[in-house]
């Protein structure tokens, strides 16, 4: 069973001093943040017993394995059901505490009732404050039964539940008709899944015979020991004030476990600590009684004295629960109550015994759960004891259960049962997860779900290049940390597998499924150099660069050009996807902007060093386009252009530029400057006769503006071939500007 205890402090004079503490003795309990241990949960369960809302309760975590609930402001806050949940995975367990108001109309004679399947359970509610009205019994909040108030027997209302079955388990309450639910008597009924003394899926297995009020768990056959007792069969008493499966916990405060209710995993339920009894666990046991709720009687023989915490304390020469066994009778010594081995191991088990006459090797035997008897292979004889050593054959899962060491001499016999847990080494159910990769390293999360048993003591990561026959490389890592595999080959697939181990010999599990993880490309190392750039318009920039010459193939897939506009805080990235490219045209830039420019080589997703940056100032955008451009042929070699000035000019025009192109021609267009910006017409001369031309123009202030509409016009026929177009603005002749 899970080592989980819910303690309720029942000093009820002041509700603000009331607290509930949940303590886990499980390894790794309550850490929550790691994959191996979910957190302890402690809460009030309002599903069945609903009480008026109050201020929220305060939850405090004390270390990794303890959580405390405080903040109760009034007695009604305490009434109801509280639960603590702890343990991991299939071992996750809920422990329940039911609190009754000491001032209720009806009080339970006994809160927790643990019964076997098929038994008759009797719940008894004692009248504390009488009302002459019906008593209503509920089960898990729903109506269950009614009793007339005359049906009380000796001031008690009884609910008989014959032939109970596990579904009958739950919270029962007895309430006077139309009384507050806070005045109810609340009970907890736990119905074991088997008849008395049996456990297992078909209830075919025999319980170990739990002592001192321990209860046999119907699923695993283990004894759930009362607080203050330990051992496979609860045969051993803890020191006063101690509890937990290994007596490892200590009751808080100077008065030890007085005033505390202990709740343990089902099917135990709740009781006072060892040595205490009463509804508030504040009364010491009467003489001759001991244990949880003082339910046990000492009946000591041969001069033994009764200790209310541990039972009979025997005088020299005697032992046994009632001091009924003489020390002449052989006795098994210091046998561990529980041993743990890994599957398929061949452990050695020691069993020591003393007595008069002295036990010898052949007088000690070991019996497995299936009845097989093992004889010891060797014995170590010391003055006060004989220790027999048994070599156990390869363990299988069926070997889990209660083993027995038995000693027999002419003086009598003794036996000691102990629990052997055969654990299955953990096997990962999933492959490890890749977190990040670089060219020569992989960062891997080894935490995966697994079959078999924990706790996980070590995690081994095995890896080698894919399709390789070379030996696996292995790295041992902390279970809760990510692993970096280093010194790998770039752009290489690696097969990676996890192997988990649990404590003990043979605890290494099989390797988990492989996964393929691929390292990144090698980083490009060459640094480009910006050779030059020139502005091809207010929003266009041509950039050229070079790379240093190095032997061997170029490591790179292309180039990344970056333009940083510091004024606006914007970056423009341009991808050039050929590693052979050494020039690029950047368009759509913002006119009049100061850019910082650099270029980097890239390979896969990795960037090489950036070139030293260059600073580029684009000219501001020019004026709007001239309006109403019109062309008119004057002769076989002259065409007159007329236009209107652009509207909304940002400043004075410095010149106009006319573009002349033969319609349908393949050659480059000619640009002709009109340097007298006040003019609105010009004559283009030197044209070919009977030829169709296309014209458009734009203005310039600091930069060139937008093009006007394109117009077409043909020169007149029968002229001679001209040398080429020239322009005349009114009477002035201007040279050709290409």
């Amino acid at each position: 069973a899970v080592d989980l205890t819910l303690l309720a402090n029942l000093r009820l004079t002041d509700p603000q001093r009331f607290f509930l503490t949940c303590v886990s003795g499980e390894a790794g309990a309550g850490r929550g943040s790691d994959a191996w241990g979910p957190p302890l949960l402690l809460e009030k369960d309002d599903r069945i017993v609903r009480t008026p809302p109050g201020p929220p309760l305060r939850l405090a975590r004390n270390g990794s394995h303890q959580v405390t609930l405080r903040g109760f402001s009034k007695p009604s806050d305490l009434v109801g059901v509280f639960s603590c949940v702890g343990g991991a995975g299939a071992r996750r367990t809920r422990v329940i505490y039911v609190h009754n108001s000491p001032g209720a109309h009806l009080l339970p004679d006994k809160v927790t009732h643990t019964v076997n399947k098929g038994d008759t359970a009797v719940l008894s509610a004692r009248v504390h404050k009488e009302k002459q009205t019906d008593v209503i019994w509920k089960s898990n909040g729903s109506y269950f039964y009614t009793l007339d108030w005359h049906e009380a027997q000796d001031g008690r209302f009884l609910l008989q539940l014959p032939n109970v079955q596990p579904p009958s388990s739950g919270i029962y309450s007895a309430t006077y008709l139309e009384a507050s639910p806070l005045g109810s008597a609340f009970f907890r009924l736990i119905v074991r899944g088997c008849g008395a003394g049996r456990w297992g899926p078909g209830c075919t297995k025999e319980c170990p015979g739990c002592l001192h009020g321990g209860v046999c768990h119907d699923h695993d056959g283990e004894c759930v020991c009362p607080p203050g007792f330990t051992g496979t069969r609860c045969e051993q008493a803890c020191r006063e004030g101690r509890f937990g499966q290994s007596c490892q916990e200590q009751c808080p405060g100077i008065s030890g476990c007085r005033g505390l209710t202990f709740c343990l995993p089902d099917p135990y339920g709740c009781s006072c600590g060892s040595g205490w009894r009463g509804s508030q666990c504040q009364e010491a046991c009467a003489p001759g009684h001991f244990g949880a709720d003082c339910r046990l009687q000492c009946q000591c023989q041969n001069g033994g004295t009764c200790d209310r915490f541990s039972g009979c304390v025997c005088p020299s020469g005697w032992h046994g629960v009632h001091c009924e066994k003489s020390d002449r009778i052989p006795q098994i010594l210091n046998m561990a109550s529980e041993l743990e081995f890994n599957l398929e191991t061949m452990p050695r088990i020691n069993c020591a015994a003393a007595g008069n006459p002295f036990p010898v090797r052949g007088s000690i035997e070991l019996r497995k759960p299936d009845g097989t008897v093992l004889l010891s292979t060797k014995a170590i004889v010391e003055p006060e004891k004989t220790t027999a050593e048994f070599e156990v054959p390869r363990l299988v899962l069926a070997d889990s259960g209660f083993w027995e060491c038995r000693v027999s001499t002419s003086g009598g016999q003794d036996s000691r049962r102990f629990k052997v847990n055969v654990k299955v080494p953990p096997v990962p159910l999933a492959a490890p997860r890749l977190l990040t990769k670089q060219s020569r390293q992989l960062v891997v999360s080894p935490l995966v779900s697994f079959s078999g048993d924990g706790p996980i003591s070590t995690v081994r990561l095995h890896y080698r290049p894919q399709d390789s026959t070379m030996d696996w490389s292995t790295i041992v890592v902390d279970p809760s940390e990510n692993v970096t595999l280093m010194n790998l080959r770039p752009k290489t697939g690696y097969s990676v597998r996890v192997q988990l181990s649990r404590p003990g010999e043979g605890g290494e599990g099989a390797w988990g499924p492989p996964t393929l993880m691929t390292t990144d490309c090698p980083e490009p190392l060459l640094q480009p150099w910006l050779e030059g750039w020139h502005v091809e318009g207010t929003d266009r920039l041509r950039v050229s660069w070079s790379l240093p010459l190095v032997p061997g193939p170029l490591v790179g897939d292309g180039f990344l050009l970056r333009l940083w506009d510091g004024t606006r805080g914007q970056e423009r990235r341009e991808n050039v996807s050929s590693p052979q490219a050494r020039t690029a045209l950047l368009t759509g830039l913002t006119p009049g902007t100061h850019y910082q420019l650099d270029v980097q080589l890239y390979h896969c997703t990795l960037l090489g060093p950036a070139s030293p940056p260059a600073h580029v100032l684009l000219p501001p955008s020019g004026p709007p386009a001239p309006r109403h451009l019109h062309a008119q042929a004057l002769s076989d070699s002259e065409i007159q252009l007329t236009w209107k000035h652009p509207e909304a000019l940002p400043g004075p025009i410095s010149k106009y530029v006319v573009e002349v192109q033969v319609a349908g021609g393949a050659g480059d267009p000619l640009w002709i400057d009109v340097d007298r910006p006040e003019e609105t017409s010009t004559i283009i001369r030197g044209l070919n006769a009977s030829t169709r031309y296309l014209f458009r123009m734009r203005a310039s202030i600091q930069g060139l503006g937008d093009w006007s509409n394109t117009v077409e016009e043909s020169t007149l026929g029968n002229g001679l071939q001209a040398e080429g177009p020239v322009q005349e603005s009114r009477a002035a002749e201007e040279g050709l500007d290409q």
Partner: antibody
Framework: EVQLLESGGGLVQPGGSLRLSCAAS????????MFWVRQAPGKGLEWVSR????????YYADSVKGRFTISRDNSKNTLYLQMNSLRAEDTAVYYC????????????????WGQGTLVTVSS | QSVLTQPPSLSVSPGQTARIACSGD??????ISWYQQKSGQSPVVVLY???RRPSGIPERISGSNSGNTATLTISGTQAVDEADYYC?????????FGGGTRLTVL
């Protein structure tokens, strides 16, 4: 599905006897307190008798005390009302009804009623 | 034994709010249930514990209980609401019924 089915009603002369039955199904009959409630023609509802789940405790309205006996057979899931010394004023539709207690409450209410059986006392 | 008093009849137009009162000595200290009985049918619980509705009962039906009066309220009354309505309380596990109110939807 919870069902209550009354039977045994009919015409009877004053001073005569009649035994009503109520067959219950669809619930754990032995856990519930059961009632007989009657309704005279054109009148309101009147409580007649109640019996506790164990059958050990029974109560009656003053108007029927000493003449009517309520009983139950938990093994047969049946409620009975033995009516003796019948009078004209006992003429009514007789309903058997179950009470329950809701979640979060300690108060009864009638959650299921039978369809009723008519008892006519006349000469 | 306690007595619960109801008006014999109440008439409302469709869509109006109907309020049926049930009075009795210190009624607010007890839980009241209300039952609807349509002509020729068995009673059906419409409210218990003063104001709680069983499943299937429309939200138009609500209740309150304080002082000496418990009230059943039907808002937006419909023709299907035409029936006799009985209040009921408990006197030491003995059921006490009101005389009933016939609700007529005009």
């Amino acid at each position: 599905e919870v069902q209550l089915l009354e039977s045994g009603g009919g015409l009877v002369q004053p001073g005569g006897s009649l035994r009503l039955s109520c067959a219950a199904s669809g619930f754990t009959f032995s856990s519930y307190m059961m009632f007989w409630v009657r309704q005279a023609p054109g009148k309101g509802l009147e409580w007649v008798s109640r019996i506790y789940p164990s059958g050990g405790w029974t109560y009656y309205a003053d108007s029927v005390k000493g003449r009517f006996t309520i009983s139950r057979d938990n093994s047969k899931n049946t409620l009975y009302l033995q009516m003796n010394s019948l009078r004209a004023e006992d003429t009514a539709v007789y309903y058997c009804a179950r009470v329950t207690v809701p979640l979060d409450s300690g108060s009864y209410y009638f959650d299921y009623w039978g369809q009723g059986t008519l008892v006519t006392v006349s000469s | 034994q306690s007595v619960l008093t109801q008006p014999p009849s109440l008439s409302v137009s469709p869509g109006q709010t109907a309020r049926i009162a049930c009075s009795g000595d210190n009624l607010g200290s007890r839980y009241i249930s209300w039952y609807q009985q349509k002509s020729g049918q068995s009673p059906v619980v419409v409210l218990y514990q003063d104001y709680r509705r069983p499943s299937g009962i429309p939200e138009r039906i609500s209740g309150s209980n304080s002082g000496n009066t418990a009230t059943l309220t039907i808002s937006g009354t419909q023709a299907v609401d035409e029936a006799d309505y009985y209040c009921q309380a408990w006197d030491r596990s003995t059921a006490v019924f009101g005389g009933g109110t016939r609700l007529t939807v005009l």
